[in-house]
């Protein structure tokens, strides 16, 4: 996920002042961990699995639709927006399904839902070093999507510690 991508999205935000209702822009990308494992989805009508795994050479990477929104609400740390606005995203692997935070279970789930999406589907986007991003729960500041035991989970991050913790860093790629 190159730095100019964030700059491009920020330019798009500056050009329009939509808050929370419709996405500023949308971007289709594959999602992988800091260690280059792919996030993949196996989804049926009534069940799903989210895997964090090494992919074979011939395996096409799953893509997620990232929809970018502006938010006036500050998170526990300044996010990567402009003029004090937060940049939030929703992540959808296919039509009508979105990743959602389940804060009680500390889990990341896939849910079929209609718009307007619940707050649990929104994540504050943070631009990190090494061309990585992290996703902070809108509903629970300080809690991020992360990798635990080869699955996605919600991970509480202590801001006095290193926010560059590898297990909450993700790469976005159009390839």
């Amino acid at each position: 996920f190159e730095a100019q991508k964030i700059e491009w999205h920020e330019a798009a935000i500056e050009g329009r002042s939509i808050t929370g209702i419709s996405p500023i822009t949308e971007y289709l990308a594959s999602l992988s961990t800091y260690n280059d494992q792919s996030i993949t989805f196996a989804l049926e009508d009534e069940s799903y699995e989210i895997y964090v795994e090494d992919l074979k050479k011939d395996k096409k990477k799953d893509k997620v639709l990232l929809s970018y929104y502006e938010s006036q609400h500050p998170s526990s740390e300044s996010g990567d927006g402009v003029d004090g606005k937060m940049l939030m995203v929703t992540l959808s692997p296919t039509k009508d399904f979105w990743l959602q935070a389940n804060n009680k279970e500390h889990s990341v789930e896939l849910h079929k839902c209609e718009k307007p999406l619940p707050d649990q589907a929104f994540f504050v986007l943070h631009n990190r070093s090494f061309n990585c991003v992290s996703f902070e729960c809108k509903t629970d500041p300080g809690v991020f999507i992360g990798v635990k035991d080869n699955h996605l989970a919600l991970i509480k991050v202590d801001y006095s510690e290193n926010l560059g913790s590898e297990n909450i860093l993700f790469k976005l790629s159009e390839i």
């Epitope: 989804l43 049926e44 009508d45 074979k56 296919t94």
Partner: antibody, heavy 126, light 106 residues
């Protein structure tokens, strides 16, 4: 419960046409890619054609390209295979099959066939 | 397109292990699926993504895939496992099946 029910098979002369249907129920039809797979008497399985959930992308085996057309009507939960210029070697049981998983934004064909119909017999003979 | 080669037949005694191979160029770079088909019936998916079992498939079915060969193993083969077995891969948005292997339980 996922159900796939093929129909439209029968006896047809070489050069003739036939349209197969596959009625689907028990799942969100438009979310899944669907395929046709055939099996000649006493022979193995042969993939024939596939179509994306929206119907926007279609795929064919070389052996049927230009003669067969796959389509779907998501409002009727039905998959079709229009077979033209039929040959004796097209004689087979034709199965419709559903992908194991919902098609993602990445698209393409990559999932196994999770569910199969009972098949419909097509005989091409003079 | 890859040609997937399976042995035409494999014989096994009840309770013993049956191994069915599926050979093709750079097979290990692709994900293999395996289907079971009994006479007069439609195929059933028994293994996907090389090693994974769909719900309802007994644990005695397992798979592996590396190099140029994918393998379906039935450990503790039962009479009910007598059937034809087909491997399958996707290659450039084209489905490819192996020729099939008839497993006979002696």
């Amino acid at each position: 419960e996922v159900q796939l029910l093929e129909s439209g098979g029968g006896l047809v002369q070489p050069g003739g046409s036939l349209r197969l249907s596959c009625a689907a129920s028990g799942f969100t039809f438009s979310s899944y890619a669907m395929s046709w797979v055939r099996q000649a008497p006493g022979k193995g399985l042969e993939w024939v054609s596939a179509i994306s959930g929206s119907g926007g992308s279609t795929y064919y085996a070389d052996s049927v390209k230009g003669r067969f057309t796959i389509s779907r009507d998501n409002s009727k939960n039905t998959l079709y295979l229009q077979m033209n210029s039929l040959r004796a070697e097209d004689t087979a049981v034709y199965y419709c099959a559903r992908d194991l998983w919902i098609q993602l934004w990445g698209g393409g064909l990559r999932y196994p066939f999770g569910y199969w119909g009972q098949g419909t017999m097509v005989t091409v003979s003079s | 397109l890859p040609v997937l080669t399976q042995p035409p037949s494999v014989s096994v005694s009840p309770g013993q292990k049956a191994s069915i191979t599926c050979s093709g160029e750079r097979m290990g770079d692709k994900y293999a699926a395996w289907y079971q088909q009994k006479p007069g019936q439609s195929p059933i998916l028994v293994i996907y993504q090389d090693t994974k079992r769909p719900s309802g498939i007994p644990e005695r079915f397992s798979g592996s895939n590396s190099g140029n060969t994918a393998t379906l193993t039935i450990s503790g083969t039962q009479d009910m496992d007598e059937a034809d077995y087909y491997c399958q891969v996707w290659d450039s948005s084209t489905g490819v099946f192996g020729g099939g292997t008839k497993v006979t339980v002696l």
